[in-house]
């Protein structure tokens, strides 16, 4: 499956929008930094079949979409930027879903891939727990925004490697 060129443009647009969403001085949030245990090894792209990589990317984008679709997120961010960001993510999900169907077909997803998807889900659970513990404070959201920018960058790099494999 060849992801459309618009997909990588959408990736870049999503990152730009996320960068623009900041509302407070990042410097004031230094003490709130947190290790969410991003599963980097799931995004290095070496041990995966293409179908598995696409499934993990899909899970990453889906969980990001879910995180920024909550009521708490709506209260934290400027509405028009948030809507544009969500739209970009939604388009990426559609592209990836089409690819998942094409690449995997009717085959069962390998167990290794289930572990990878679980690692991504647990990562987002840790992010949600952090936000809850910090009572969804402005700094907590800034830290999460920075973290998601970093994890989306890993996703973008994995997609670039997948395109090079084609």
């Amino acid at each position: 499956c060849d992801l459309p060129q618009t997909h990588s443009l959408g990736n870049r647009r999503a990152l730009i929008l996320l960068a623009q969403m900041g509302r407070i001085s990042h410097f004031s949030c230094l003490k709130d930094r947190h290790d969410f245990g991003f599963p980097e090894e799931e995004f290095d792209g070496h041990q995966f079949q293409k179908a598995q990589a696409i499934s993990v990317l899909h899970e990453m984008i889906q969980q990001t979409f879910n995180l920024f679709s909550t009521e708490d997120s709506s209260a934290a961010w400027e509405q028009s930027l948030l809507e544009k960001f969500s739209t970009e993510l939604y388009q990426q999900l559609n592209d990836l879903e089409a690819c998942v169907i094409q690449e995997v077909g009717v085959e069962e997803t390998p167990l290794m891939n289930e572990d990878s998807i679980l690692a991504v889900r647990k990562y987002f659970q840790r992010i949600t727990l952090y936000l809850t513990e910090k009572k969804y404070s402005p700094c907590a959201w800034e830290v999460v925004r920075a973290e998601i920018m970093r994890s989306l960058s890993f996703s973008t790099n994995l997609q670039k490697r997948l395109r090079r494999k084609d």
């Epitope: 990042h26 410097f27 230094l30 930094r33 290790d35 920075a146 973290e147 970093r150 960058s153």
Partner: antibody
Framework: EVQLVQSGAEVKKPGESLKISCKGS????????IGWVRQMPGKGLEWMGI????????RYSPSFQGQVTISADKSISTAYLQWSSLKASDTAMYYC??????????????WGQGTLVTVSS | DIQMTQSPSSLSASVGDRVTITCRAS??????LNWYQQKPGKAPKLLIK???SLQSGVPSRFSGSGSGTDFTLTISSLQPEDFATYYC?????????FGQGTKVEIK
């Protein structure tokens, strides 16, 4: 490959102005803050201040506040450190280094090669 | 400001020795501490991040420990290329202060 390349050595007279640079490459420049560190001859490291190139927000060490200005031009992936009126005591090696901001990644993992500033009459 | 006090300020050791450098913060900085190595005429090099995590590409003879106010950098078996000055830096609060440095010299 991530690189921070600093401008060359400078020899200036007291009272003169100066702007030194730090150009980032091999990574997304606006995703990392750029910090500046001073090292006077035979002395230790002193943290001067930092800039977020995405919005040019800055934070200075109280020791350097008002003495220097940190700026950035994200269109050319370059951060700057400048003086409006140099003093002999500004003679030092100046380093830039990148910081991942609020993301959980190594702080100051890449450094520039340093710019030696000599101020003498 | 958070003061960072390193000890000793210098030490003499032989190749193969186990070397320990300590760094004390004037208030708790959790695990927000880096250790750097600097050789004459060169930029500092990150060795240890987050107090105990080895930076990529750094030999495993280097290790870091501690949390809160007391931190340690250990070189398990000193090599000829390890003779340098070592600095700790707190990254918890502004300004991001350094320790005064520890020079490791050949005995």
């Amino acid at each position: 490959e991530v690189q921070l390349v600093q401008s060359g050595a400078e020899v200036k007279k007291p009272g003169e102005s100066l702007k030194i640079s730090c150009k980032g490459s091999g990574y997304s420049f606006t995703s990392y803050w750029i910090g500046w560190v001073r090292q006077m001859p035979g002395k230790g490291l002193e943290w001067m201040g930092i800039i977020d190139p995405s919005d040019s927000d800055t934070r200075y060490s109280p020791s350097f506040q008002g003495q220097v200005t940190i700026s950035a031009d994200k269109s050319i992936s370059t951060a700057y450190l400048q003086w409006s009126s140099l003093k002999a005591s500004d003679t030092a090696m100046y380093y830039c280094a990148r910081h991942p901001g609020l993301a959980w990644a190594p702080d100051f993992d890449y450094w520039g090669q340093g710019t030696l500033v000599t101020v003498s009459s | 400001d958070i003061q960072m006090t390193q000890s000793p300020s210098s030490l003499s050791a032989s190749v193969g020795d186990r070397v320990t450098i300590t760094c004390r913060a004037s208030q708790s900085i959790r695990n927000s501490l880096n250790w750097y190595q600097q050789k004459p005429g060169k930029a500092p090099k990150l060795l240890i991040k987050w107090a105990s995590s080895l930076q990529s590409g750094v030999p495993s003879r280097f290790s870091g420990s501690g949390s809160g106010t007391d931190f340690t950098l250990t070189i398990s078996s000193l090599q000829p290329e390890d003779f340098a000055t070592y600095y700790c830096q707190q990254l918890y609060d502004w300004p991001l202060t350094f320790g005064q440095g520890t020079k490791v010299e050949i005995k």
